[in-house]
Interface confidence: medium
């Protein structure tokens, strides 16, 4: 299965910023603006979806204002003239705090999610395909602006409908990548013979050859937590499992379990309250001895995104985080094909699972 390629992100753009939206807006396009509200200067910022760079034709003006208790203005500007404002008297942003702002373009409206929660719907006043530019200005610092093209065969709407009058505000859930150390190594063996992709936010430009079983897909950001899925064929040497997601800002712990029946063959348990990555096996409800050693500092960071790659080899599991090998876990349950269930739970938001 191939996912249509997405535009490359704008990384750490200076504000004020204006950038082209390649191909313009399309139904299903998701645009993520990730940044931090400045704590000092200014009381407003804005994200504009517009035609050209002049600012005279803005299909959607999204304008949080830290004034009068805080509110958000949505509006449209045509030929230099503003229309009637739509105000949301709730402020999901905080000064000095990071945010993750997602705009989903749909046929009738823009749906806006702030830190993973649906915040507002803004119905189109002008045809959205006229939009070819995104601009950001005001009291904000940007980490990135990313673009995710519509995927084929979505299972359900990408944003579940939340009543306008019932906003839910969670702490910010930024997905900005942290600075990486210089290049470590890649790669290993055996082609994946059968791959199932459970995708929420498919990576820009990601492509898969058609697997033997069609991919299961969970549209962004609808991963159910805890997330449980079958590993078709179980584990075997060269089998890899790939997960990516974001640690919640207030996270205490999360876990990734590879299970065999009632046993947990591999329990990977990052603990922020202990600054540790605990590994263990549970057989008949009895835990074995924990393994905690790491070759470097805790790789998971509250509020930041991560990727975990678990590679099964004959004698052990190899685990890499963010492209760097972290540890090996020697098999305690050695009947690999029976290890056929993946369970993920705890204080994370999943964005991609490939089994």
């Amino acid at each position: 299965m191939a996912f249509s390629g997405s535009q490359a992100p704008y990384l750490s753009p200076a504000v004020p910023f204006s950038g082209t939206i390649q191909g313009g807006l399309q139904d299903g396009l998701q645009i993520t603006v990730n940044g931090t509200v400045l704590s000092s200067s200014g009381t407003r910022f804005a994200v504009n979806f517009q035609t050209g760079f002049s600012g005279n034709d803005i299909a959607f003006h999204f304008n949080p204002r830290f004034e009068d208790g805080g509110y958000v203005v949505c509006n449209t500007r045509q030929n230099g003239s503003w229309g009637p404002e739509e105000r949301k008297t709730h402020m999901p942003f905080q000064k000095g705090m990071p945010f993750d702002l997602c705009f989903l373009v749909q046929s009738s409206d823009f749906k806006v999610m702030v830190n993973g929660i649906l915040f507002v719907q803004y119905f189109h006043r002008v045809p959205f395909h006229r939009v070819d530019t995104i601009s950001v200005n005001g009291s904000v610092q940007l980490s990135y602006i990313s673009f995710q093209n519509p995927r084929t065969v979505p299972v359900q709407p990408a944003f579940s409908t939340v009543p306008f009058s019932q906003p839910v505000c969670f702490p910010p859930r930024p997905r900005g990548r942290r600075q990486k150390p210089p290049g470590v190594w890649p790669a290993n063996p055996a082609p994946i013979t059968q791959t199932v992709i459970h995708t929420v936010q498919s990576a820009p430009g990601q492509m898969f050859s058609t697997p033997a079983i069609p991919p299961m897909m969970y549209p962004h950001p609808a991963y159910p937590m805890p997330f449980i899925t079958t590993i078709l064929g179980g584990l075997y040497p060269s089998k890899s499992i790939l997960l990516s997601g974001t640690v919640l800002p207030s996270a205490q712990r999360f876990h990734i379990n590879l299970c065999s029946g009632n046993h947990i063959a591999f329990h990977l348990n990052p603990r922020f309250d202990e600054n540790a990555v605990v590994r263990n096996t549970q057989i008949d409800n009895s835990w074995g001895s924990e393994e905690r050693s790491l070759p470097r500092k805790m790789p998971f960071v509250r509020g930041q995104s991560f990727s975990v790659w678990i590679l099964c080899e004959a004698h052990c599991l190899k685990v890499a985080v963010d492209g760097q090998h972290l540890f090996e876990y020697y098999h305690r349950l050695r009947n690999l094909p029976t290890i056929n269930r993946l369970e993920v739970g705890g204080d994370i938001q999943l964005t991609h699972v490939q089994t």
Epitope: P186, P189, A203
Partner: antibody, heavy 119, light 107 residues
Framework: EVQLVESGGGLVQPGGSLRLSCAAS????????IHWVRQAPGKGLEWVAG????????SYADSVKGRFTISADTSKNTAYLQMNSLRAEDTAVYYC????????????WGQGTLVTVSS | DIQMTQSPSSLSASVGDRVTITCRAS??????VAWYQQKPGKAPKLLIY???SLYSGVPSRFSGSRSGTDFTLTISSLQPEDFATYYC?????????FGQGTKVEIK
């Protein structure tokens, strides 16, 4: 099916520049390392550079450091090797190859593109 | 840089022969060694990784082993399609290096 296709090779004068492309398909591009390996005519293999698109890691052989730049465009599933200040000894077939997991095992290779540096 | 010294540089053998190629790393590389086969005008193909793990789809007559910093590729019974050049590679550090290659020719 995993495929890597190189392009951009050709004849260039010493001191000149060339940009090679490696178009990838059949896998989740951003989660795999992509490497460039070269082979001078009648010689052995020499690893040149590698990149991990998801994290932006890059790594270079000492022989090309400062002259070559590896990059990746995840929107196009393509890796690039920008080669500047080319020398006669850079003449080779350049292969791009996919790394798997986080080790330097190169499990899929392209067909190669020939770069000739000559006046 | 870690050097990989491969020997012999070439060898002549007959179909059915047992062939052994060795590589010595200039320092410890753990088991982070792979072996590749390359035929003229073609890209290399992965045979062995992690010193001794057989890559998917590679015939079982190929095997790899490790003894300290010495690594060995063995072809238990040489077949006509095995005449090629073989390379070892270490990937222990952030920079990979290959051995010089061993050309296996028909006797």
């Amino acid at each position: 099916e995993v495929q890597l296709v190189e392009s951009g090779g050709g004849l260039v004068q010493p001191g000149g520049s060339l940009r090679l492309s490696c178009a990838a398909s059949g896998f989740t591009f951003r989660y795999y390392y992509i490497h460039w390996v070269r082979q001078a005519p009648g010689k052995g293999l020499e690893w040149v550079a590698g990149i991990y698109p998801y994290g932006g890691y890059t790594s270079y052989a000492d022989s090309v450091k400062g002259r070559f730049t590896i990059s990746a465009d995840t929107s196009k599933n393509t890796a690039y090797l920008q080669m500047n200040s080319l020398r006669a000894e850079d003449t080779a077939v350049y292969y791009c190859a996919r790394g798997y997991y986080v080790e330097g095992v190169l499990d899929y290779w392209g067909q190669g593109t020939l770069v000739t540096v000559s006046s | 840089d870690i050097q990989m010294t491969q020997s012999p540089s070439s060898l002549s053998a007959s179909v059915g022969d047992r062939v052994t190629i060795t590589c010595r790393a200039s320092q410890s590389v753990s088991s982070a060694v792979a072996w590749y086969q390359q035929k003229p005008g073609k890209a290399p193909k992965l045979l062995i990784y992690s010193a001794s793990s057989l890559y998917s789809g590679v015939p079982s007559r190929f095997s790899g082993s490790r003894s300290g910093t010495d690594f060995t590729l063995t072809i238990s019974s040489l077949q006509p399609e095995d005449f090629a050049t073989y390379y070892c590679q270490q990937y222990y550090g952030s920079l990979a290096t290959f051995g010089q290659g061993t050309k296996v020719e028909i006797k």
